[in-house]
């Protein structure tokens, strides 16, 4: 039975050329986290595997950095980076938990962090 919840950084914004940390946290479950995937739409950005550690997709190596923790840092942001990002927790025995973050990359310097919110 899937009892866990994922807390994410929610809706966030950042400046073009800057960087942003995407963070998710899985709670309310004793399930073992075997892997966390970071995806943008259907593109795999990075994997953090319990045995192997981090793997960054080759096409994102220049602009994606692992961490902090199970989070992901996006660097040298462009307006094209605006969109949905997903953290997918692969766990045993629960299965798959997904958290969603919406990132807006702004031209100006009025970028502000949105509030944190829960995704069941």
């Amino acid at each position: 039975m899937m009892t866990g919840t994922i807390e994410t950084t929610g809706n966030i914004s950042a400046e073009k050329g800057g960087s942003i940390i995407l963070q998710c946290h899985l709670s309310s479950t004793t399930a073992q986290v075997t892997q966390v995937n970071w995806e943008q739409q259907d593109q795999l950005l990075a994997i953090c595997n319990a045995d192997l550690g981090w793997h960054i997709s080759p096409s994102f190596k220049d602009r994606v950095a692992p961490g902090p923790g199970l989070g992901l840092t996006l660097q040298s942001l462009t307006v094209n980076d605006t969109g949905e990002y997903f953290c997918i927790y692969h766990t045993y025995p629960d299965g798959t938990y997904t958290g969603r973050i919406f990132l807006e990359v702004l031209e100006s310097s009025v970028a502000e962090h949105g509030a944190r919110f829960q995704i069941p």
């Epitope: 192997l52 299965g95 798959t96």
Partner: antibody, heavy 119, light 107 residues
């Protein structure tokens, strides 16, 4: 080319033991989680067990927990399934399969090895 | 465990036709459903995963759709090599479970 070759199947009496092997080639074995899946004579597929890339984590279906042990030797590029206290319902074709790097499905399968449990 | 009901269990079609195979889960599995092709003498082939993602090397004549509990595999412009057994499998929670299979035969 990615290849998985199972061996070790055969006829065994109820309560007996058997050890299956799966030899992997054509890819970096130590990077991938691996699974065993079986197919009954009625052609039903059932996930049996899984092991993480480094072997630190093992998972089993309730039907085999406590009786089957999945293991791997990354130096030998080989996956194992040790089966004990075998029952007639364990009769099946046993396949080893590679889990995708993103953990979503099983992207390469072997041809399988047949296990028959009968007195 | 998540139960997967696959239909039809048998399907006869002619080359050139487009067919659909359905899988229904007894509880929501989000988008996490995969489709496999099984042919005698060959190893099982992953076609689609996460509901609609086409596995690398698989022709676009294969497509998947669905979310939650209801999923569909569509095969367009059937060719002789497409006649085979097809299975769906949920990969949302353990134990991973499979549908009962669909045998696609030439009419």
């Amino acid at each position: 080319e990615e290849q998985l070759v199972e061996s070790g199947g055969g006829l065994v009496k109820p309560g007996g033991t058997l050890k299956l092997s799966c030899a992997a080639s054509g890819f970096t074995f130590s990077t991938y989680a691996m699974s065993w899946v079986r197919q009954s004579p009625e052609k039903r597929l059932e996930w049996v067990a899984e092991i993480s890339s480094g072997g630190s984590y093992t998972y089993y279906s309730d039907t085999v927990t406590g009786r089957f042990t999945i293991s791997r030797d990354n130096a030998k590029n080989t996956l194992y399934l040790e089966m004990s206290s075998l029952r007639s319902e364990d009769t099946a074709m046993y396949y080893c399969a590679r889990k995708t790097l993103d953990y979503y499905a099983l992207d390469y399968w072997g041809h399988g090895t047949s296990v028959t449990v009968s007195s | 465990d998540v139960q997967i009901t696959q239909s039809p269990s048998y399907l006869a079609a002619s080359p050139g036709e487009t067919i659909t195979i359905n899988c229904r889960a007894n509880k929501t599995i989000s988008k996490y459903l995969a489709w496999y092709q099984e042919k005698p003498g060959k190893t099982n082939k992953l076609l689609i995963y996460s509901g609609s993602r086409l596995q690398s090397g698989i022709p676009s004549k294969f497509s998947g759709s669905g979310y939650g509990t209801d999923f569909t595999l569509t095969i367009s412009s059937l060719e002789p090599e497409d006649f085979a057994m097809y299975y769906c499998q949920q990969h949302n929670e353990y134990p991973w479970t499979f549908g009962g299979g669909t045998k696609l035969e030439i009419k």
